[in-house]
């Protein structure tokens, strides 16, 4: 189903409005912001996610990287310009005219410019590290109940084929989470990388996107785990293009 | 401890239809998908489909598309397999299995239900 | 669809002996060295099994005597000193992408 029928509501993202206007009187979403319409059966992607979370109201407000070409989202919040699939545009520019490139998963990849710049095709983010330190406990958690949990919970919370989680790190008390999907991997149907990444950030920081769900509880063998910090680096199949004075700044 | 308990045998006409239920205990219902898995008098395994407990949702394989639908009921915490045109060839033993915890492996089997479908 | 050939498809050895059932995949099933092969047992009337799952890791409460190896396209599983009660028939199976298959089975028995 792509919404659920008795309340019409959208499972999958709460940034959304329903009504039962859909073919003969299905519940069909539309985001906040854009107003396109939305798959409940599955993750809304990041763009359309930032554009809602930009157009509702204003409310109170990242070890080691895996390459130099590594991203870091440090720009945060922005209104992004959509394409009709809902993916980012590959050029994205401000009120004031300031343009720059940005990847799949909408971070930015090269520096600032203006409307003339170019941006040929949107970089495809193929590789993320999530990096997250939990807080203290009693003892350290075995990795392989670990590995399994976080696994599962991609699976059946972000839809992700586990095939996607590349590998599951553990040195007390950073866990690292890699995920991979290359193009060629990446079939119809499939949630994409950076769209379950932003699903994930979003929960462990409390602010879930899933309608009517509880926040996400995260336990190993019945052990809470806790994150206290997470950073999330991007590596995108072209490595990015700064200028020299942003690389040693 | 985790158990998947499913209904009793069925005899069936052809062209009628039968569901299937699996009623799961010992664990939280909504963690993990189920799928269902048949097989044929002395035969080999052959994949269904899955549901997504926590969406409610199914993924079908296309041997069986529009013939196969799989629910869940979280209240109770039962999946559903229901074979619709039913043929002789559809009579075999049929199974839930829950997904495991990593790589989609099939932890846990439901006992086992025999469709005989016959006229 | 990806196909699963086991081999051979019957198979007796001997109390003690090693017995070795083989499983090739029409297409590689691993992913960033994750290989999504599993093994299963089947006793007459009884539901499958789970033996080994990603290849070759030793699902919880089964037998160390049973190992699983291979990556890619070829695997393998390992019977290293055959037991009476491990008479069944053990299929291979991958989860790489669905429809996910099985392989035909193979018939272990004593010799």
């Known amino acids: 189903h792509t919404a659920a029928q008795d309340n019409c509501t959208c499972p999958t993202n709460k940034m959304t409005v329903c009504s039962p206007d859909g073919p003969g009187g299905r519940c069909q979403c539309r985001a906040l912001g854009s107003g396109m319409a939305v798959d409940c059966s599955t993750l809304t992607s990041k763009c359309l996610l930032l554009k809602a979370r930009m157009s509702a109201p204003k409310n109170a407000r990242t070890l080691v990287r895996p390459s130099e070409h590594a991203l870091v989202d440090n720009d945060g919040l922005y209104d992004p310009d959509c394409d009709p699939e809902g993916r980012f545009k590959a050029r994205q520019c401000n009120q004031t005219s300031v343009c720059w490139c940005v990847n799949s998963v909408g971070v930015r990849r090269t520096d600032k410019g203006d409307l003339s710049l170019r941006c040929d095709e949107l970089v495809r983010t193929h590789h993320i590290l999530i990096d997250l330190r939990h807080r203290p406990t009693a003892g350290a958690f075995n990795h392989s109940d670990l590995d399994a949990e976080l696994r599962r919970l991609f699976r059946e919370r972000y839809r992700l084929h586990p095939k996607f989680v590349a590998a599951v790190h553990y040195e007390q008390p950073t866990i690292q989470i890699e995920l991979r999907q290359n193009t060629s991997q990446k079939a119809a149907g499939d949630v994409d990388i950076g769209d379950a990444a932003y699903y994930f950030e979003r929960d462990i920081k409390g602010e879930s996107l899933f309608q009517g769900r509880g926040g996400l509880d995260l336990r190993v063998r019945g052990e809470p785990l806790q994150v206290e910090r997470t950073l999330i680096y991007y590596l995108d199949e072209i490595p990015p293009k700064f200028s020299m004075k942003r690389l040693t700044a | 401890q985790v158990q998947l308990v499913q209904s009793g045998a069925e005899v069936k006409k052809p062209g009628s239809s039968v569901k299937v239920s699996c009623k799961a205990s010992?664990?939280?219902?909504?963690?993990?998908?189920i799928n269902w898995v048949r097989q044929a008098p002395g035969q080999g395994l052959e994949w269904m489909g899955v549901i997504s407990t926590y969406y409610g949702d199914a993924s079908y394989n296309q041997k069986f598309k529009g013939r196969v639908t799989i629910t869940a009921d979280e209240s109770t915490s039962t999946a559903y397999m229901e074979l619709s045109s039913l043929r002789s060839e559809d009579t075999a033993v049929y199974y839930c299995?829950?997904?495991?915890?990593?790589?989609?492996?099939?932890?846990?089997w439901g006992q086992g239900t025999l469709v005989t479908v016959s006229s | 669809d990806i196909v699963m050939t086991q081999s051979p498809d019957s198979l007796a050895v001997s109390l003690g002996e090693r017995a070795t059932i083989n499983c090739r995949v029409s297409e590689s099933v691993d992913s960033y060295g994750n290989n999504f092969m599993h093994w299963y047992q089947q006793k007459p009337g009884q539901p499958p099994k789970l033996l080994i799952y990603?290849?070759?890791n030793l699902e919880s409460g089964v037998p160390d005597r049973f190992s699983g190896s291979g990556s890619g396209t070829d695997f393998t599983l390992t019977i290293s000193s055959l037991q009476a009660e491990d008479v069944a028939v053990y299929y291979c199976q991958q989860s790489y992408e669905d429809p996910y298959t099985f392989g035909q089975g193979t018939k272990l028995e004593i010799k």
């Open positions: 299995a829950r997904y495991g915890d990593g790589y989609n492996q099939f932890d846990y």
């Open positions: 010992g664990y939280t219902f909504t963690d993990y998908s």
């Open positions: 990603r290849a070759s």
